[in-house]
């Protein structure tokens, strides 16, 4: 349904509050370095313009596309060239090339200061003084640091952020009430950002077909009672929503997501028995709830797949007539029977099935050729099962911190060219799979673990893409979306790596380490561990453990000393010498 004015249409659909919030998110995700005040000014100008179009859709410029309107507005920023360099060249282009150009300049690791949380009283005063500005600032700070954050979901986070301050700033112990809530929002926000980043990477690097395959598998696991046609409709709509959000079309995305939630709730009887509670919630909570809803129970009686996908004489005929539909049906049928498999495993099985049919349907006796296709599935299923079993045993034996350290060593040896901060961040997140997934029963471990690892390895891929340093990382990241994890798992020690020169400065520590939180202190130690491995890739576990134990003792000793700085200076020299001797540097 064509509208005379797209901007008026979206303003009316979304309402002023959501419209302004989404435009702010969009602008902050594009111009990540611009000051808050500049963005607020731009948003207010766009909002005033939208209101004129609501009043009269035929008014001047109201017929322009949202990309044109927003792009024109972004290109009015005076400091564009000096702040963003070549991104300013985007403004010389016409739509749609201009928007594509802005998208390509989104920075997954912008050079922005770390967000430091002020004192609780300071935050509560700011919240009470100007609630609207306080919440806009939250949207702005998150959006500019996470340029692919799922915009409608960020509105949900902002709503929870507001609720936390509303409740806790009136509490007797404000800090005890507020800080755990803010920690939870921060951790959930990082996870949400990373999950969405994988969806956008899937769409942008591997195409719509790859995303749709992922969605078929996931929705079939979640809604196993739904018919294939119903799942297909949901997949089409969900693909549109995420394509829009990943493409910076945040107003359309939020609007279409609301429509999808409405459709799902109106048709829940033919989708899932688990949606009742979600569908009673307000819009933002409803959409979030649907996205996180637990898998419905499998129908009581599902036949073996062999009849339709191996034994039938029509396999090649059905495949030839509509390849993607037939493969989609295979994926749907397999996924709804296997909530215990990761989505990426299901996609590997579907790919194996597709490859077999491509080969066999051209053979003299197709049926004879593909009759044993599912024998090829066994090793594909057992590989992640065994890997998860081994790593959960290691996690239970070591605990999270030491398990992260084991992964740090493993991954630094695999790809030592990658920057130390990236290796630390990615390995710490990989290590969190233990506490996140190993507590689950067998039937839930694989979907939890392997699909989480896909999200974390995508972080490595997008960070590496910005400044590529390792052919091995590029290869694992670009060859196959579903085989990224097996590709990284299969990497051995990089024998071509020339060890880094020893630099005593890297291992020089100061008294400020004593005031850090436990988490930040861990990061310091893990940074040192990565540097050690880069200096001595052939170091044994025992050697590294000895040096790290000495390091922990050194920090503990000097943090208890009266003259901390002198202790760090003198004991630090001894530690460096001892470490060099222990590692034969």
């Amino acid at each position: 349904d064509a509208h005379k004015s797209e901007v008026a249409h979206r303003f009316k659909d979304l309402g002023e509050e959501n419209f302004k919030a989404l435009v702010l998110i969009a602008f902050a995700q594009y111009l990540q370095q611009c000051p808050f005040e500049d963005h607020v000014k731009l948003v207010n100008e766009v909002t005033e313009f939208a209101k004129t179009c609501v009043a009269d859709e035929s008014a001047e410029n109201c017929d322009k596309s949202l990309h044109t309107l927003f792009g024109d507005k972004l290109c009015t920023v005076a400091t564009l060239r000096e702040t963003y360099g070549e991104m300013a060249d985007c403004c010389a282009k016409q739509e749609p090339e201009r928007n594509e150009c802005f998208l390509q300049h989104k920075d997954d690791n912008p050079n922005l200061p770390r967000l430091v949380r002020p004192e609780v009283d300071v935050m509560c005063t700011a919240f009470h003084d100007n609630e609207e500005t306080f919440l806009k600032k939250y949207l702005y700070e998150i959006a500019r640091r996470h340029p692919y954050f799922y915009a409608p979901e960020l509105l949900f986070f902002a709503k929870r952020y507001k609720a936390a301050f509303t409740e806790c700033c009136q509490a007797a112990d404000k800090a005890a009430c507020l800080l755990p809530k803010l920690d939870e929002l921060r951790d959930e926000g990082k996870a949400s950002s990373a999950k969405q980043r994988l969806k956008c990477a899937s769409l942008q690097k591997f195409g719509e077909r790859a995303f749709k395959a992922w969605a078929v598998a996931r929705l079939s696991q979640r809604f196993p009672k739904a018919e294939f046609a119903e799942v297909s409709k949901l997949v089409t709509d969900l693909t549109k929503v995420h394509t829009e959000c990943c493409h910076g079309d945040l107003l359309e995305c939020a609007d279409d997501r609301a429509d999808l939630a409405k459709y799902i709730c109106e048709n829940q009887d033919s989708i899932s028995s688990k949606l009742k509670e979600c569908c009673e919630k307000p819009l933002l909570e409803k959409s979030h709830c649907i996205a996180e809803v637990e898998n419905d129970e499998m129908p009581a009686d599902l036949p073996s797949l062999a009849a339709d996908f191996v034994e039938s004489k029509d396999v090649c005929k059905n495949y030839a007539e509509a390849k993607d539909v037939f493969l989609g049906m295979f994926l749907y049928e397999y996924a709804r029977r296997h909530p215990d498999y990761s989505v990426v495993l299901l996609l590997r099985l579907a790919k194996t099935y597709e490859t077999t049919l491509e080969k066999c349907c051209a053979a003299a006796d197709p049926h004879e050729c593909y009759a044993k296709v599912f024998d090829e599935f066994k090793p594909l299923v057992e590989e992640p099962q065994n890997l998860i079993k081994q790593n959960c045993e290691l996690f239970e034996q070591l605990g999270e911190y030491k398990f992260q350290n084991a992964l740090l060593v493993r991954y630094t040896k695999k790809v030592p060219q990658v920057s130390t901060p990236t290796l630390v961040e990615v390995s710490r997140n990989l290590g969190k799979v233990g506490s996140k997934c190993c507590k689950h029963p067998e039937a839930k471990r694989m979907p939890c673990a392997e699909d989480y690892l896909s999200v974390v390895l995508n972080q490595l891929c997008v960070l590496h893409e910005k400044t590529p340093v390792s052919d091995r990382v590029t290869k694992c990241c670009t060859e196959s979306l579903v085989n990224r994890r097996p590709c990284f798992s299969a990497l051995e020690v990089d024998e071509t790596y020339v060890p880094k020169e020893f630099n005593a400065e890297t291992f020089t520590f100061h008294a400020d380490i004593c005031t850090l939180s436990e988490k930040e202190r861990q990061i310091k130690k893990q940074t040192a561990l990565v540097e050690l491995v880069k200096h001595k890739p052939k170091a044994t576990k025992e050697q590294l453990k000895a040096v790290m134990d000495d390091f922990a003792a050194f920090v503990e000793k000097c943090c208890k000393a009266d003259d901390k700085e002198t202790c760090f200076a003198e004991e630090g020299k001894k530690l460096v010498a001892a470490s060099q001797a222990a590692l034969g540097l």
């Epitope: 599902l302 797949l305 024998d375």
Partner: nanobody, 124 residues
Framework: EVQLVESGGGLVQAGGSLRLSCAAS????????MGWFRRAPGKEREFVAA????????YYADSVKGRFTISRDNAKKTAYLQMNSLEPEDTAVYYC?????????????????WGQGTLVTVSS
């Protein structure tokens, strides 16, 4: 957790019949696809028959089609394998298996729980 115990095996003449039972304890078996597999001396374990959760669908290896019938009684937590027209080639240890999420009924890796097996010997 499901524990499976097979019974009903034994020695039988070629052309004769046997009925194997598989009694489950622990979980309710109505959530599981139930299957029978066998291992003949010196051979790999092979699929025999399987039945869907409610019993509406059955699935057989080509070698036993028309001779063996699989059934189940969810209330009694038991699966059965009725074996008629037995042949010496049917001699094997027969294993009962339960699969929570089976898609390919004939694949052993799709089954989570296994019994200890019961020996069936068919003499000529």
């Amino acid at each position: 957790e499901v524990q499976l115990v097979e019974s009903g095996g034994g020695l039988v003449q070629a052309g004769g019949s046997l009925r194997l039972s598989c009694a489950a304890s622990g979980s309710n078996i109505s959530s599981y696809v139930m299957g029978w597999f066998r291992r003949a001396p010196g051979k790999e374990r092979e699929f025999v028959a399987a039945i869907s959760r409610s019993g509406g669908y059955t699935y057989y290896a080509d070698s036993v089609k028309g001779r063996f019938t699989i059934s189940r009684d969810n209330a009694k937590k038991t699966a059965y394998l009725q074996m008629n027209s037995l042949e010496p080639e049917d001699t094997a240890v027969y294993y009962c298996a339960a699969g929570r999420y089976s898609a390919w009924y004939s694949q052993s890796y799709e089954y989570d729980y296994w019994g200890q097996g019961t020996l069936v010997t068919v003499s000529s």
